[in-house]
């Protein structure tokens, strides 16, 4: 058993049929010694008396808010949560496996630049009685500070018969140099509590590996005289690290119709302009990627050909 | 410690081309190592990230773009003395800071070159003959060093009398390649910045 936060405790249980469970001793936070009784949740049934209560925790029915009273007055609470371990593996029932970039990916994180700011998100089908708490650091043995905000519900989607909820959190490394060469990864830890179930999820990464620039901005087309070609130009996204001559991007320019199956024109360039063949009913799209360290491409920025 | 704005004329910077070749060569070599040593811990997640130049050179600080010198977090610089002459510098326009930066890059290359050559000598003794260093990568390191053209003491190649542990050598190769790729990215960024300034 360990303390998650004040008056909230996590009991780690090996979860299998007829498991013996864990013996837990609760102590009432009071100077009083006599006349103390214990109850669980909203029940008025007295579970025991005395300053300490010893319970055998085997299942979710044994978890919950234990309260010690004296003469009708509440003295203190202890909330017991369960963390299940099945076949030596901690349960991951609360969050959905996003399977990208690999199986057992519950947390996904991205950074728009090298400033040390990043966003992580996760998915769940659970809509109520759900809380998250996020901590992060650079390295684990001698951790350096990373500050995370509160996790918020950022999107709701319908997936077949199910509703899916996306939560996200923004974090910022306390003292980040955009030009630094990372040797220790960022660690992100998410505590998830659903009703009386506790789970924790972690992710470890270098900012350089989670870079995904914003799409290029200000796409413009200039038809070329006596030709089917057009010159397309764009600018670096505002959120990208500066100076741009140091943090350079490379671009992919594509002309394609509405369907992915349609024919296309595609060219890669390090410049902020390119010449392509425009077709009726097609769009010109441009996306960006770090020129020197190939992490993710940005989303496409698009303009219609016509 | 930063790069000044007064740097060589555009297109007059022979090191840019060599640094692009360097990044390409080390990336290819790392990819090859990851494929060949698939049953060894050779991915970014599996290895320890070590920097053999730590406390010996200070390339990131010495080559910091002017725009980042206002960032306190970028200025935990280490004092290191460097030799200051070189042919990538556009003669009179060269500043002391830029010489310091390029000299630091040269020292990095020299250190990695020695490590790679020592390692290759060990790998050539491996009866499995599983992996060797790409001669192209070693040649590209050499070309960039020649383009930088700094005079510095030659570092003797480390020789070892004991029987090499090939498993450890291959893991060290992965560690070295990962670190060198990161440094090659920094070098490429620096050369691009200098070329554009």
């Amino acid at each position: 058993i360990w303390e998650l936060k004040k008056d909230v405790y996590v009991v780690e249980l090996d979860w299998y049929p007829d498991a013996p469970g864990e013996m837990v001793v609760l102590t009432c936070d009071t100077p009083e010694e006599d006349g103390i009784t214990w109850t669980l949740d909203q029940s008025s049934e007295v579970l025991g008396s005395g300053k300490t209560l010893t319970i055998q925790v085997k299942e979710f029915g044994d978890a919950g808010q234990y309260t010690c009273h004296k003469g009708g007055e509440v003295l203190s609470h202890s909330l017991l949560l369960l963390h299940k371990k099945e076949d030596g593996i901690w349960s991951t029932d609360i969050l959905k496996d996003q399977k990208e970039p690999k199986n057992k990916t519950f947390l996904r994180c991205e950074a728009k630049n090298y400033s040390g700011r990043f966003t992580c998100w996760w998915l769940t089908t659970i809509s109520t009685d759900l809380t998250f708490s996020v901590k992060s650091s650079r390295g684990s043995s001698d951790p350096q500070g990373v500050t995370c905000g509160a996790a918020t519900l950022s999107a709701e989607r319908v997936r077949g018969d199910n509703k899916e909820y996306e939560y996200s959190v923004e974090c910022q490394e306390d003292s980040a140099c955009p030009a630094a060469e990372e040797s220790l990864p960022i660690e992100v830890m998410v505590d998830a509590v659903h009703k009386l179930k506790y789970e924790n999820y972690t992710s470890s990464f270098f900012i350089r590996d989670i870079i995904k620039p914003d799409p290029p901005k200000n796409l413009q087309l200039k038809p070329l005289k006596n030709s089917r070609q057009v010159e397309v130009s764009w600018e670096y996204p505002d959120t990208w690290s500066t100076p741009h001559s140091y943090f350079s991007l490379t671009f992919c320019v594509q002309v394609q119709g509405k369907s992915k199956r349609e024919k296309k024109d595609r060219v890669f360039t390090d410049k902020t302009s390119a010449t392509v063949i425009c077709r009726k009913n097609a769009s010109i799209s441009v996306r960006a990627q770090d020129r020197y360290y190939s992490s993710s491409w940005s989303e496409w920025a698009s303009v219609p050909c016509s | 410690r930063n790069l000044p704005v007064a740097t060589p004329d555009p297109g007059m910077f022979p090191c840019l081309h060599h640094s692009q070749n360097l990044l390409r060569a080390v990336s290819n070599m790392l990819q090859k190592a990851r494929q060949t040593l698939e049953f060894y811990p050779c991915t970014s997640e599996e290895i320890d990230h070590e920097d053999i130049t730590k406390d010996k050179t200070s390339t990131v600080e010495a080559c910091l773009p002017l725009e980042l010198t206002k960032n306190e977090s970028c200025l935990n610089s280490r004092e290191t003395s460097f030799i200051t002459n070189g042919s990538c510098l556009a003669s009179r326009k060269t500043s002391f800071m830029m010489a310091l930066c390029l000299s630091s890059i040269y020292e990095d290359l020299k250190m990695y070159q020695v490590e790679f050559k020592t390692m290759n000598a060990k790998l050539l003794m491996d009866p499995k003959r599983q992996i060797f260093l790409d001669q192209n990568m070693l040649a590209v390191i050499d070309e960039l060093m020649q383009a930088l053209n700094f005079n510095s003491e030659t570092v003797p190649q480390k020789s070892s009398l004991e029987e090499p542990d090939f498993y450890k050598t291959k893991i060290k190769l992965c560690i070295l390649l990962h670190a060198f790729r990161i440094r090659a990215v920094t070098i490429d960024r620096v050369m691009s910045y200098l070329n554009a300034s």
Epitope: R228, R261, E262, K263, K264, V267, T275, R279 | -
Partner: antibody, heavy 118, light 107 residues
Framework: EVQLVQSGAEVKKPGATVKISCKAS????????LHWVRQRPEKGLEWMGW????????EYAPKFQGKVTITADTSTDTGYLELSSLRSEDTAVYYC???????????WGQGTLVTVSS | DIQMTQSPSSVSASVGDRVTITCRAS??????LHWYQQKPGKAPKLLIK???QSISGVPSRFSGSGSGTDFSLTINSLQPEDFATYYC?????????FGGGTKVEIK
């Protein structure tokens, strides 16, 4: 299977015109760009131009502008290359090539040898 | 027009050898470069697109690298069926242009 089948070899006199064909099968003809590439004896490859069979748009290499005409007939899934004012240096194998992407060549015809000789 | 220069123009090698062919562009073309193999009396065949992207059905011993002006095609362990002429082609701008070719011959 995506395939391009070209017409047979031609022998022409200098000054004449020749029209060679390239019949597409295994895909929707208008879904791919169609290119023509020349290869002179013991020489390399030269790109001549492309057509978008969907709308008839064409683009020619400056070197071949006025010399060649590329057309396409969507009713027969066939592309054509017409070479005019033939000279001995036009003796070559002419390949048609197709791709959904405009700038490189995924599928090739077997080639048509055009010999210009008096 | 962008000139593409291949080297060497021919190379003699044995089965099992590692062969590298290079291609240089007269100006920077990013990764807009493709490689083809041509056997005598046959049409060219696409091997690699956009400098390093593999093509399905092409053996993994063929790999490409490069960007900007310098590119290379590597055949890792030469097989009897690999003796052919190899061409690079730039797609950075029209007109599309090819290198002069590199003939890989049996030693």
């Amino acid at each position: 299977e995506v395939q391009l089948v070209q017409s047979g070899a031609e022998v022409k006199k200098p000054g004449a015109t020749v029209k060679i064909s390239c019949k597409a099968s295994g895909y929707t003809f208008s879904d791919y760009y169609l290119h023509w590439v020349r290869q002179r004896p013991e020489k390399g490859l030269e790109w001549m131009g492309w057509i978008d069979p969907e709308n008839g748009d064409t683009e020619y290499a400056p070197k071949f502008q006025g010399k060649v005409t590329i057309t396409a007939d969507t009713s027969t899934d066939t592309g054509y290359l017409e070479l005019s004012s033939l000279r001995s240096e036009d003796t070559a194998v002419y390949y048609c090539a197709a791709n959904k992407e405009l700038r490189y060549f995924d599928v090739w015809g077997q080639g048509t040898l055009v010999t210009v000789s008096s | 027009d962008i000139q593409m220069t291949q080297s060497p123009s021919s190379v003699s090698a044995s089965v099992g050898d590692r062969v590298t062919i290079t291609c240089r562009a007269s100006q920077s073309i990013s990764i807009n470069l493709h490689w083809y193999q041509q056997k005598p009396g046959k049409a060219p065949k696409l091997l690699i697109k956009f400098a390093s992207q593999s093509i399905s059905g092409v053996p993994s011993r063929f790999s490409g690298s490069g960007s900007g002006t310098d590119f290379s095609l590597t055949i890792n362990s030469l097989q009897p069926e690999d003796f052919a002429t190899y061409y690079c082609q730039q797609s950075n701008s029209f007109p599309l242009t090819f290198g002069g070719g590199t003939k890989v011959e049996i030693k």
